[in-house]
């Protein structure tokens, strides 16, 4: 039975040209996390494999940095980065848990700076 829950940063906003940390946390389960995938729509951004570490997709290598922890840092944000991001936790024996984050990249300084995981 899947007892775990995923907490995410929820809906966040950031300024164009800036950086943001996407963060998820899996709790309430003793399942072993074998891999975490970060995806945007159907595009794989990066994976963090429990045994082999991080792998960043080549097309995002210049703008994506691993961490902190199992999170992902997006840099040099553009308006095109606006959209849904998913953290997919592959666990054993529970199976797959998915969290959703919506990022809005704003043109001007109207982006909120209060988001807990945002980089100033």
């Amino acid at each position: 039975m899947m007892t775990g829950t995923i907490e995410t940063t929820g809906n966040i906003s950031a300024e164009k040209g800036g950086s943001i940390i996407l963060q998820c946390h899996l709790s309430s389960t003793t399942a072993q996390v074998t891999q975490v995938n970060w995806e945007q729509q159907d595009q794989l951004l990066a994976i963090c494999n429990a045994d082999l570490g991080w792998h960043i997709s080549p097309s995002f290598k210049d703008r994506v940095a691993p961490g902190p922890g199992l999170g992902l840092t997006l840099q040099s944000l553009t308006v095109n980065d606006t959209g849904e991001y998913f953290c997919i936790y592959h666990t054993y024996p529970d199976g797959t848990y998915t969290g959703r984050i919506f990022l809005e990249v704003l043109e001007s300084s109207v982006a909120e700076h209060g988001a807990r995981f945002q980089i100033p």
């Epitope: 074998t34 891999q35 994976i47 045994d51 082999l52 570490g53 080549p58 592959h90 054993y92």
Partner: antibody, heavy 122, light 107 residues
Framework: QVQLVQSGAEVKKPGASVKVSCKAS????????MHWVRQAPGQGLEWMGI????????KYAQKFQGRVTMTRDTSTSTVYMELSSLRSEDTAVYYC???????????????WGQGTLVTVSS | DIQMTQSPSSVSASVGDRVTITCRAS??????LAWYQQKPGKAPKLLIS???SLQSGVPSRFSGSGSGTDFTLTISSLQPEDFATYYC?????????FGGGTKVEIK
């Protein structure tokens, strides 16, 4: 098309080391992990370990820990498996095999090399 | 480590026969099971992933089923090119482990 071409057969003495190479082509080398699997004569398949060609990180089966080293050369799209302190029980065909999908890394192998026979005999 | 047990270890069958091979995992692996076919002197070939998903180019006479701990590979009508050894493999967690193999021989 995807191809994994392994080095030729080797005959080694007990206590020696062997290094088997596996040259990959037909896909982006750093986008897929690589497994090593061996098969003793008339026996089943035995997983030895896996390497990430992009990072060079490895995970070895406990049985081979301390005796096996997996490395890669991204400039030639080649992975290597070195096994040391050889004994007669290490006589086997050694296969490199490409991981099926980075989204589920390390789960299964879809393309295999032709195999390299390593014979350990005094 | 997860142990994989295959049965039978060998089976004699004729062309046109239905052949069933079973694989049992020592603990639940959901649907994370693969089947490989290996012919003498050749490398294994991936037939089925995710317990029942046929790989591209694999004939439809091959089918896989099961989840949890018990899995089955079925060849609905055995063809001459199907005489080989078949291995199951758990694909849920490292280290990868294989079943001992089932040799399908000509009766």
């Amino acid at each position: 098309q995807v191809q994994l071409v392994q080095s030729g057969a080797e005959v080694k003495k007990p206590g020696a080391s062997v290094k088997v190479s596996c040259k990959a082509s037909g896909y982006t080398f750093t986008e897929y992990y690589m497994h090593w699997v061996r098969q003793a004569p008339g026996q089943g398949l035995e997983w030895m370990g896996i390497i990430s060609p992009s990072a060079g990180s490895t995970k070895y089966a406990q049985k081979f820990q301390g005796r096996v080293t997996m490395t890669r050369d991204t400039s030639t799209s080649t992975v290597y498996m070195e096994l040391s302190s050889l004994r007669s029980e290490d006589t086997a065909v050694y296969y490199c095999a490409r991981d099926h999908d980075i989204r589920l890394a390390g789960r299964l192998a879809d393309y295999w090399g032709q195999g390299t026979l390593v014979t350990v005999s005094s | 480590d997860i142990q994989m047990t295959q049965s039978p270890s060998s089976v004699s069958a004729s062309v046109g026969d239905r052949v069933t091979i079973t694989c049992r995992a020592s603990q639940g692996i959901s649907s994370w099971l693969a089947w490989y076919q290996q012919k003498p002197g050749k490398a294994p070939k991936l037939l089925i992933s995710a317990a029942s998903s046929l790989q591209s180019g694999v004939p439809s006479r091959f089918s896989g089923s099961g989840s949890g701990t018990d899995f089955t590979l079925t060849i609905s009508s055995l063809q001459p090119e199907d005489f080989a050894t078949y291995y199951c493999q758990q694909a849920v967690i490292l280290p990868i482990t294989f079943g001992g193999g089932t040799k399908v021989e000509i009766k």
